[in-house]
Amino acid sequence: PASLAGCYSAPRRAPLWTCLLLCAALRTLLASPSNEVNLLDSRTVMGDLGWIAFPKNGWEEIGEVDENYAPIHTYQVCKVMEQNQNNWLLTSWISNEGASRIFIELKFTLRDCNSLPGGLGTCKETFNMYYFESDDQNGRNIKENQYIKIDTIAADESFTELDLGDRVMKLNTEVRDVGPLSKKGFYLAFQDVGACIALVSVRVYYKKCPSVVRHLAVFPDTITGADSSQLLEVSGSCVNHSVTDEPPKMHCSAEGEWLVPIGKCMCKAGYEEKNGTCQVCRPGFFKASPHIQSCGKCPPHSYTHEEASTSCVCEKDYFRRESDPPTMACTRPPSAPRNAISNVNETSVFLEWIPPADTGGRKDVSYYIACKKCNSHAGVCEECGGHVRYLPRQSGLKNTSVMMVDLLAHTNYTFEIEAVNGVSDLSPGARQYVSVNVTTNQAAPSPVTNVKKGKIAKNSISLSWQEPDRPNGIILEYEIKYFEKDQETSYTIIKSKETTITAEGLKPASVYVFQIRARTAAGYGVFSRRFEFETTPVFAASSDQSQIP
């Protein structure tokens, strides 16, 4: 087979129709789309293209210039009257720049064979395009059969002599793709087999998915895959001041389009998205989490003078619990409960009040009852102690009432009803409470426990005792019941306002049983235990004994 290497064809004077062609071509010089990267564009090459025609009387370059005097590289061939044409045009080496699939866009005109007299037998209306891959930039000394055919190119529109007369050119554009490519570069070849062709421009390009910022993730320029149906998964990187839960990914299609986004970046706490970037929250604004869309104003009673705040600081005397979200207003302890009233029923007290005028901005207000027992004479108060029961409870009361039971009768109490909320324990300020003073009702007194015998004679016994431990009121009098031992049904009762009595008219040398009880306005208490004392014999001296156990 003939070698395709060797001679350059010298430019010759172009026929009129080529000049017309060029005018048409100039009108089609458009910018390439952003997802196409040109490896070769014959329209933009300023100097010699360095292409080879073989044989040298086949394809010829027409040297023309555009309105800016830049050269226009056009190749033409029109050997339609001669048989067995095999004219080749070889490009220079084209780097594929890492692309594994490239596109070839041809702009050309083709003469209609029917419009040519006498050449119907030899005239063709197609030409062939080939490629040969090579790592070598000087590898054009190759054989025809080493080229791989890309396609046979036919014209959608061919022109006639009439078109020439009307100065109308019909420019065809055909695009073919080649891949997968495995070497650093390649050569293209155009084979004419007897057509009348003007090759106006050759543009070789690959497609990329252009670098883009999507969902705050930067995706780099990505060369499309070799396969026309292939989607390349590309990882994005988060823009400044942004973070991600799920690494951002997108898919680059063979057409150079970004598809199927997965994951996204979010502006980190203290930053918000504006115009595809993460901007700092300004003073007075905050963003607590990346998952929040934008910076928000500090909630009530809080502030921040910082940029990039993730929370706001509470004003003086306002607080935030750890469990309070940063979007919640800072709050303060409640004011005191109001209008407390009491209802005493014997040794029980029912307290009722209304909520504080100021809840401190919180809904978790509850109440605590402090109980103090006060000595009315000394004016000293002490904690009530554990014997008092609170219904339903002493602290954490949600309702505005409480009942205290098992109080001491006829005792002065002070109850402090304190309002508390979720930040009361954070505040160093004074407790906020309302006080209620009550005195429990009188009740029957407790038993007399401490009885001492005094002077004992043959016919009388003198006794003294102490007031009951719990008088439960004012002791009005005592009742003393006594009888001769084993004669219980025949007893005598003496009443006394004092804590001493003398029982008269007793039998000498006899044992008597004494029991004492006290009375208040509420009634008698229970009798004390039995105390036994014996009168002296007729001739014995009287005795004065101390306390009987």
């Epitope: 300004r282 003073p283 502030y303 003078h305 600081v313 003086k316």
Partner: antibody
Framework: EVQLVESGGGLVQPGGSLKLSCAAS????????IHWVRQAPGKGLEWVAS????????YYADSVKGRFTISRDNSKNTLYLQMNSLRAEDTAVYYC?????????????WGQGTLVTVSS | DIVMTQSPDSLAVSLGERATINCKAS??????????MNWYQQKPGKAPKLLIY???NLESGIPDRFSGSGSGTDFTLTISRLEPEDAASYYC?????????FGQGTKLEIK
């Protein structure tokens, strides 16, 4: 009670240096932005510089940029203004003022001021 | 920088009358629906005192005869019934953008 007290003012020659202090009390100093504002004799107020509570954000007026440095020591509740390459036009009463807590913030408390005189 | 221009430079108003001071910013001092405009009062030999923040919010402890209005670039301080102690210089200040610029001041005298 919130108080700001400036000190360190005085007479200095052109090209000289001076360091002003502002002692703060009555509030949580470390959470407040503080500003320096000056007033030349018989003139209006001119904002000079500001610093956030954590010193993360600092701003200067163009007229003092590169010559003045604002700083703070939160452990001492004190704000500073280091003034270098002083010029006659820096003569003024210098006030420190606290950024407020009610949004959008104004300068809610001011010191009594300290006079800086730059003269040969 | 945002330039703040007050008008008038000075004015004299009778006791009990209304006084109005205007302030114009060279560009908007609004952000996110709020106006970053403050008004201060200064008496001779004293430190300035904050009267109004955020264009219309009365600072705590300031009498309610003081009021502020406006948004964007045009703002007004109004004293509804002038009292003797209101004789002072008044300054507007924007806090939307660094540097926080002041107006040149307006001197208010009692007629």
């Amino acid at each position: 009670e919130v108080q700001l007290v400036e000190s360190g003012g005085g007479l200095v020659q052109p090209g000289g240096s001076l360091k002003l202090s502002c002692a703060a009390s009555g509030f949580t100093f470390s959470t407040f932005g503080i500003h320096w504002v000056r007033q030349a004799p018989g003139k209006g107020l001119e904002w000079v510089a500001s610093i956030s509570g954590a010193s993360t954000t600092i701003y200067y007026a163009d007229s003092v940029k590169g010559r003045f440095t604002i700083s703070r020591d939160n452990s001492k509740n004190t704000l500073y203004l280091q003034m270098n390459s002083l010029r006659a036009e820096d003569t003024a009463v210098y006030y420190c003022a606290r950024y407020g807590t009610s949004f959008p913030y104004g300068l809610d408390y001011w010191g009594q001021g300290t006079l800086v005189t730059v003269s040969s | 920088d945002i330039v703040m221009t007050q008008s008038p430079d000075s004015l004299a108003v009778s006791l009990g009358e209304r006084a109005t001071i205007n302030c114009k910013a060279s560009q908007s001092v609004d952000y996110d629906g709020d106006s970053y405009m403050n008004w201060y009062q200064q008496k001779p030999g004293k430190a300035p005192k904050l009267l109004i923040y955020g264009a219309s919010n009365l600072e705590s402890g300031i009498p309610d005869r003081f009021s502020g209005s406006g948004s964007g670039t045009d703002f007004t301080l109004t004293i509804s019934r002038l009292e003797p102690e209101d004789a002072a210089s008044y300054y507007c200040q924007q806090s939307n953008e660094d540097p926080f610029t002041f107006g040149q001041g307006t001197k208010l005298e009692i007629k």
